[in-house]
């Protein structure tokens, strides 16, 4: 079991970990389709991590700790895009993760949202391992971009995030 998140450190008693769900405008797109803006949330914050020099034999207490600000609860919703000029596929559904709540959680841990898990293999086909992060893209940082080489209709895709609402 992962160690519980740390909110305070003895060395820095005046500092507290924080992790918030910030409102963003997410642009959902797909090649050949009209992009759509939706309201979503991004996890943003500063959670504690530390590394203490090791010993041999190793002491029983954990010497390395890492928390990350990630979704505590999210759900997956369909966003339908119109694709003018595509007779065979006039509309495409994309699944978008809607983040409800965020919290500091162990870095190696799968985010504790109870929704659908998404694993993305590389373009080089089966056999390539999904990354340690159990999402197709890192959780967005305001102003950042998370493009994808080939845009699957089901992949949550944040082309750009707007300022906090």
């Amino acid at each position: 079991a992962a160690p519980p998140p740390i909110n305070k450190l003895a060395l820095f008693p005046d500092k507290s970990a924080w992790c918030e769900a910030k409102n963003i405008t997410q642009i959902v797109g797909h090649s050949g389709c009209e992009a759509k803006s939706i309201q979503n949330r991004a996890c943003l914050g500063q959670c504690f991590s530390y590394s203490v020099p090791n010993t041999f034999p190793q002491s029983t207490e954990s010497l390395v700790h890492c928390d990350s600000c990630m979704p505590a609860q999210s759900m997956w919703e369909i966003v339908t895009l119109e694709c003018p000029g595509h007779e065979e596929v006039p509309r495409v559904d994309k699944l978008v993760e809607k983040i409800l709540h965020c919290s500091c959680q162990a870095c190696g841990k799968e985010p504790s949202h109870e929704g659908l898990s998404v694993y993305v293999q590389g373009e080089d086909g089966p056999g390539s391992q999904p990354g340690t992060h159990p999402h197709p893209h890192p959780h967005p940082h305001p102003g950042g971009q998370t493009p994808e080489p080939e845009d699957p209709p089901g992949a949550p895709h944040t082309e750009e995030e707007g300022a906090e609402d």
Partner: antibody, heavy 120, light 111 residues
Framework: EVQLLESGPGLVKPSQTLSLTCTVS??????????WSWIRQHPGKGLEWIGY???????YYNPSLKSRVTISVDTSKNQFSLKLSSVTAADTAVYYC????????????WGQGTLVTVSS | QSVLTQPPSVSAAPGQKVTISCSGS????????VSWYQQLPGTAPKLLTY???KRPSGIPDRFSGSKSGTSATLGITGLQTGDEADYYC????????????FGGGTKVTVL
């Protein structure tokens, strides 16, 4: 018209891994715009969605099965596959592969299905 | 137990009309399109309607779908013996345990 055909062992022992392959003909998995799905039906029961894969390798799994499910794709063979680990008798079912349209709620084409029995 | 609720069975005489209900919630039917599938004995399911009320080519207009609020309905008019089958509704569920969900199925018997 696209056709899908499931293949794999009809009998799997408990605790082993169930492996099935779906071969797609009459269309290319790589054409985009479609999800390729696995769905199962327990004997005399309703339908249960297992998961999707897109030709790029992106996968979406049923939360209740995700710890045991792996879906992969081989575009060169126009096939996608299902692996279900640690099977029990409760995994005995007819397994269907299917093509889900660009509309997620529309499963347009189905394979004929293959019965997999879990028994020692 | 299925996320979507259907009656286990309905029956009618040839030429009559039957309706099959599919009840859900705001996280599934209420906010997403519904499809209906027909499964004849010993065969794979077949898409009957999609996007609530559209029919794929080759599906006769005796089959019609509709949706209101958190419920959907499949209607079959001019019932034929060949319509005796199991019928399933399906949609996306965006609750915390998100995924593609189906009803438990309804057996249609032609008397």
């Amino acid at each position: 018209e696209v056709q899908l055909l499931e293949s794999g062992p009809g009998l799997v022992k408990p605790s082993q891994t169930l492996s099935l392959t779906c071969t797609v003909s009459g269309g290319s998995i790589s054409s985009g715009g479609y999800y390729w799905s696995w769905i199962r039906q327990h004997p005399g029961k309703g339908l249960e969605w297992i998961g999707y894969i897109y030709y790029s390798g992106s996968t979406y799994y049923n939360p209740s099965l995700k710890s045991r499910v792996t879906i992969s794709v081989d575009t060169s063979k126009n096939q996608f596959s299902l692996k279900l680990s640690s099977v029990t008798a409760a995994d005995t079912a007819v397994y269907y592969c299917a093509r889900t349209n660009s509309r997620i709620t529309m499963i347009a084409d189905w394979g004929q299905g293959t019965l997999v029995t879990v028994s020692s | 137990q299925s996320v979507l609720t259907q009656p286990p069975s309905v029956s009618a005489a040839p030429g009559q009309k039957v309706t099959i209900s599919c009840s859900g919630s705001s996280s599934n039917i209420g906010n997403n399109y519904v499809s209906w599938y027909q499964q004849l004995p010993g065969t794979a399911p077949k898409l009957l309607t999609y996007d609530n009320n559209k029919r794929p080519s080759g599906i006769p207009d005796r089959f019609s779908g509709s949706k209101s609020g958190t419920s959907a309905t499949l209607g079959i008019t001019g019932l034929q013996t060949g319509d005796e089958a199991d019928y399933y509704c399906g949609t996306w569920d965006s609750s915390l345990s998100a995924g593609h969900v189906f009803g438990g199925g309804t057996k249609v018997t032609v008397l």
